[in-house]
Amino acid sequence: LFEVKNNGTTCIMASFSASFLTTYETANGSQIVNISLPASAEVLKNGSSCGKENVSDPSLTITFGRGHTLTLNFTRNATRYSVQHMYFTYNLSDTEHFPNAISKEIYTMDSTTDIRADIDKKYRCVSDIRVYMKNVTVVLRDATIQAYLSNSSFSRGETHCTQDGPSPTTGPPSPSPPLVPTNPTVSKYNVTGNNGTCLLASMALQLNITYLKKDNKTVTRAFNISPNDTSSGSCGINLVTLKVENKNRALELQFGMNASSSLFFLQGVRLNMTLPDALVPTFSISNHSLKALQATVGNSYKCNTEEHIFVSKMLSLNVFSVQVQAFKVDSDRFGSVEECVQDGN
């Protein structure tokens, strides 16, 4: 249990297990490392705070190993609080976790998150919370988090993460709960260029969109991508795109490649969509600094576990039963499989 206190009063409590997936350079090329938050991890007192009146918000910094830290910065309004920003700092001079690293520098990566809960209730998420940063994927599991605490203990009530499914209570939190359809159907995608197939994918996609309705209420809705949607794409040396569209929506997935490490990954998501009941019916979002669905070029990335790719505060891309291979696809068939971390557990 991680606690942040001020004058003996606890303002943040958090309990979770965490792992950090990242890549680093060695003389023999790129290495992928998956670091677990050890039992010895503790709150960094001078990096954590209950916030200063009228000046700053509460933050929790957890330190472990040789100078690695995970920081959660909180903010609130009248009815809800959230982890506005998450930072992960890692020290490549830690030979235990980064053997043979060429660089010995300290790197800090950050991302916004969709961790939010009602004031005076704890945030609860049994499922994986995946936060995608530039070169790191942070995975929190079995998380109970609460900031702006009232009496130095977790509150009775809880706000559940959307990936845990419906909350035990039937009453909706504010904003409205996601209107989740059934799981999307697996679709098969194939992008071909002048030099043959550059993308092969089998996956079920779902868009989780948060928007303001005409009545000024915030709603989160899930939209399934149908196998009937039209798919197209393009093959480039450093960029492979897959576009899936229908009359109301155009979703573009952009896969990038790190030439030095021979890794491909989902680098960008762009969505243009019409939401008839929205205050602003034209919904456009893009993020080109993702690092998801990552595997070695020539191999395929596979994950049976549902993945939530946080694109922005307004959009999360949920991927089910995915197998994808980009840039180098031989004989129109998937290559060797690289399974996601969570399938291995």
């Epitope: 009146e53 009228n54 609130r76 309004n77 009248a78 009815t79 009602d118 004031i119 005076d120 702006y148 009232s150 009496n151 509150s155 009775r156 009530g157 209570t169 039937t170 009453g171 909706p172 939190p173 504010s174």
Partner: antibody
Framework: QVQLQQSGAELVKPGASVKMSCKAS????????IHWVKKSPGQGLEWIGA????????PYSQKFKDKATLTADKSSSTTYMQLSRLTSEDSAVYYC???????????WGQGTLVSVSA | DIQMTQSPPSLSASLGGKVTITCKAS??????MAWYQDKPGKGPRLLIH???TLQPGIPSRFSGSGSGRDYSFSISNLEPEDIATYYC????????FGGGTKLEIK
Amino acid sequence: QVQLQQSGAELVKPGASVKMSCKASGYIFTNYNIHWVKKSPGQGLEWIGAIYPGNGDAPYSQKFKDKATLTADKSSSTTYMQLSRLTSEDSAVYYCVRANWDVAFAYWGQGTLVSVSA
Amino acid sequence: DIQMTQSPPSLSASLGGKVTITCKASQDIDRYMAWYQDKPGKGPRLLIHDTSTLQPGIPSRFSGSGSGRDYSFSISNLEPEDIATYYCLQYDNLWTFGGGTKLEIK
């Protein structure tokens, strides 16, 4: 100890606006929401809205969102409620209230009586 | 907004007797229910929060129970000072008062 001191009674004409204040003391002003509640003989107690002084975020009851405007001044630890386009229906006692976290509305101001009359 | 339906609007009971007031929410409020006593010329007074937890200094003659959408509030051994209007308040999702129950002594 927590104290909420409200401004004095107001006699106003129909169609006019009124702005009342609520000065908080005895706690860190930006840590808690301040709520406003209407008490009238016909309707009983009604929640109007709340304001989080830390950033001015203010959710309103559907019934009052076009009637009331809540603001807060951090420097003086004071919250304000302005009521517009007043009618006789708005004649009531208005309370500012502080919740004790999840212990509902624990601290009440002494109330401001608003009388709307031509 | 969540709607709260409080009943009865008024009731009359004898000293030493017992009364029960009910509140029904338009959706599950997860036991985030409070009860208030309101007397003329005074500010409302919090009696019970979290459905059944008595505020410090409130006599045990007052009690509350319920879950989901249905909640009740009781006063036993009625005393003259209990003459007041009683309100329920949900604070699970924003805040909503019930319509009130005016208690009179026969």
